[in-house]
């Protein structure tokens, strides 16, 4: 669809005569008839297949034609067509004399014709005017013409209809050839697909309007490139949604069980060495001079009873000093000036001469020790009780009184709150520092998994398109992890992939 435009510029008929040579009376009141038709090698009369148009009287004899885009005397003249412009044409322009006001062909005498010109040729669609001048013996006509496309028609022959739009059926303007030119932020055959925020993850993000990045289930962040870990994950990370991969030193389903108490809490004092011995469990190896579960107690050097033979120990800044009883000497009163004749063995110990009577040795009865059997045996000196247990002498034996949470001969065993299987319905028991925690199977809840709740949310296979279903243990709901190309809470929506 387009318009053939003809702009009449000047008509010269100096003598004011008709084509027959007869003069007009009083002058030639001139109007024009235009016939546009298909290309003919020799332009002949016949139907004006591309259209006709007539002007009112534009002047007398010789005159210039003003541009006029309004009223009946439109100039340029418009010859609209509703077909593909063929690129060729024939044009007939007739100048007529109007003796009266009726310009209809049937109202005019045939000899009222002033001049007739006919041209034909090629004409491409375009904005530029082609100027032409046709001269006969008595008249001259100067004019220009062009073909332009109607509004919303494009292309070399005005055959492509294109209307700019900005709604959900397209966001585009039209190029000169009629192809669509997408508005910024849109793409696709009809410019109906938004271009997401730059960097928005191809699989894990999508958008419904330009420069947006909406995350698929299981993903988060401005560009939807961060996975969402399992609900309740404490000291863990994920590489795919709903994972909980524990950080070093942590364990359990939610990575909330401390496997590296030594590093996280540094419980051992006074330079002691800490060893992890299980979940929230550790052992401190004390440096000399310290004791206690956490080596928090400073030992007196006299506590180890270094003075022998009844010597008394005195603490000093740089150690200790033994005050020996009569008959003994040495750093620890270990040397005796006595012999068996002096009856040095106490508590029924028997004396044996040594080195030809220069020395002796006592053989002590049970429960006594020391070079003179002067000490009652203390079976607790070696600190045999672990985990802060208290050592008690019981005659010839000893026993450990354990702190709560520990058992065994030497309090070496951690009492498990889980030992009595407190979690019902197959719940998994986790020992905590102050009690226990049950992780319940799907369908059960409560502190001990004693409450029956809804069945496994994934049991009904709610996820579509081969998505992976995860049950959220804390809410008894499911989450679908969609494969590439699908979105939606159940992965039910395919995504138009580029």
């Amino acid at each position: 669809s387009g318009v053939f435009q003809l702009q009449l510029q000047e008509f010269i008929n100096e003598r004011g005569v008709l084509a027959s040579g007869r003069p007009c009376e009083p002058g030639c009141r001139t109007f024009f008839r235009v016939c546009l038709k298909h290309f003919q090698a020799v332009v002949s009369p016949g139907p004006c297949t591309f259209g006709t148009v007539s002007t009112p009287v534009l002047g007398t004899n010789s005159f210039a034609v003003r541009d006029d885009s309004s009223g009946g005397g439109r100039n340029p003249l418009q010859l609209p067509f509703n077909f593909t412009w063929p690129g060729t044409f024939s044009l007939i322009i007739e100048a007529w004399h109007a003796p009266g006001d009726d310009l209809r062909p049937e109202a005019l005498p045939p000899d009222a014709l002033i001049s007739k010109i006919a041209i034909q040729g090629s004409l491409a669609v375009g904005q530029n005017w082609l100027l032409d001048e046709q001269t006969s013996t008595l008249t001259r006509l100067r004019y220009s013409y062009r073909v332009i496309c109607s509004d919303n028609y494009y292309g070399d022959n005005c055959s492509r209809l294109c209307k700019k739009r900005n709604d959900h059926f397209g966001h585009y303007v039209c190029q000169p050839d009629g192809n669509l030119s997408c508005l910024p932020g849109w793409t696709g055959e009809y410019c109906q697909q938004p271009i997401c925020l730059s960097g928005c993850h191809e699989q894990n993000g999508y958008c419904s309007k330009p420069a947006e990045c909406l995350c698929r289930p299981g993903w988060q962040g401005r560009l939807c490139n961060e996975c969402i870990p399992h609900n309740g994950c404490r000291h863990g990370t994920c590489s795919t949604p709903w994972q909980c991969t524990c950080d070093e030193g942590w364990g359990g389903l939610f990575c909330d069980q401390d496997l590296n108490y030594c590093t996280h809490h540094s419980p051992c004092k006074n330079g002691a060495t800490c060893s992890n011995s299980g979940q929230r469990s550790y052992t401190c190896t004390c440096r000399p001079g310290y004791t206690g579960v956490d080596c928090e107690l400073e030992l007196s050097e006299c506590d180890s009873n270094p003075c022998r033979n009844g010597g008394s120990c005195k603490d000093q800044e740089d150690g200790y000093h033994c005050l020996c009883p009569p008959g003994y000497y040495g750093l620890h009163c270990e040397h005796s000036t006595l012999s068996c004749a002096d009856s040095p063995c106490f508590n029924g110990g028997s004396c044996r001469e040594r080195n030809q009577g220069a020395n002796y040795a006592c053989e002590c009865p049970p429960n006594f020790t020391g070079s003179n059997c002067e000490k009652k045996v203390d079976r607790c000196t070696s600190n045999p009780c672990a985990n802060g247990g208290q050592c008690l002498n019981r005659g010839p034996s000893r026993m450990c009184r354990c702190r709560p949470g520990f058992t065994g001969t030497y309090c070496e065993l951690h009492v498990s709150d889980c030992a009595r299987n407190p979690c019902a319905h197959g719940g998994t028991c986790h020992d905590l520092e102050n009690g226990l925690m049950c992780t319940c199977p799907a369908g059960f809840s409560g502190r001990r998994c004693e409450v029956r709740t809804s069945i496994d949310a994934c049991a009904s296979s709610p996820c579509f398109n081969r998505a992976t279903c995860y049950t959220d243990l804390s809410t008894d709901t499911f989450v679908c992890n969609c494969p590439y190309g699908f979105v939606g809470s159940r992965c039910e929506f395919p995504v138009g992939l580029p």
Epitope: K163, D167, F169, Y190, S208, P494, V495, G496
Partner: antibody
């Protein structure tokens, strides 16, 4: 050949809700070339566009009905739906579902047979 | 709200007559117009889209045009099977708008 079949019509009391289904067969609702729309026609009256949806879930609604209408899609079932709340007598109409083609400037080239909804106590 | 007004609202013509229905709306020529035919008790059927294009199966006697504020549907030679109500439709931003319809009958 693509066919659209509506279901869910019938008698509804004023103030209640309605959910209509449109099952698409012979073609995929996930095609990027179409929007899927709902149009209604009150008895003896003209056509009124309600809204439409793209397979991705993007929706567009007639402003005069937007507050009461929700359109959804289930690509797995190759169906789309119209939920309408707070029904009143003037919502009595034949409800059509239709396929709107991008290649046809949004013209609806396929229509369902329609389902009658009567709102009355 | 954008409105489309069809004229006439009804017409009666003889078989073989040329029938023209007009649909008017502000700057309608800048939008794509569609035309639908609805026979009594039936669903609407698309007869013209994008102003002047015919879907496959629609007879060539149906034609359309659209410029300025008016779109027209022309049936060049009315046939008995063309008895129906005809609706124009266009999109205003993201909203579909229909004309009120023109009922075509045979004299």
């Amino acid at each position: 050949e693509v066919q659209l079949v509506e279901s869910g019509g019938g008698l509804v009391q004023p103030g209640r809700s309605l959910r209509l289904s449109c099952a698409v067969s012979g073609g995929s609702i996930s095609s990027s070339s179409y929007y899927w729309g709902w149009i209604r026609q009150a008895p003896g009256k003209g056509l009124e566009w309600i809204g439409d949806i793209y397979y991705t879930g993007s929706t567009y609604y007639n402003p005069s009905l937007k507050s009461r209408v929700t359109i959804s899609v289930d690509t797995a079932k190759n169906s789309f739906y119209l939920q309408m709340n707070s029904l009143r007598a003037e919502d009595t109409a034949v409800y059509y579902c239709a396929r709107q083609a991008l290649a046809m400037g949004g013209g609806s080239d396929k229509w369902g047979q329609g389902t009658l909804v009567t709102v009355s106590s | 709200d954008y409105q489309l007004t069809q004229s006439p609202s009804s017409l009666s013509a003889s078989v073989g007559d040329r029938v023209t229905i007009t649909c008017s709306g502000q700057r309608l020529g800048d939008k794509y117009a569609s035309w639908y035919q609805q026979k009594p008790g039936k669903s609407p059927k698309l007869v013209i889209y994008e102003d002047s294009k015919r879907p496959s199966g629609i007879p060539s006697r149906f034609s359309g045009s659209n410029s300025g504020d008016d779109a027209t549907l022309t049936i060049s030679s009315l046939q008995p099977e063309d008895v129906a109500t005809y609706y124009c439709q266009a999109w205003d931003r993201d909203t579909g708008v229909f004309g009120q319809g023109t009922k075509v009958e045979i004299k």
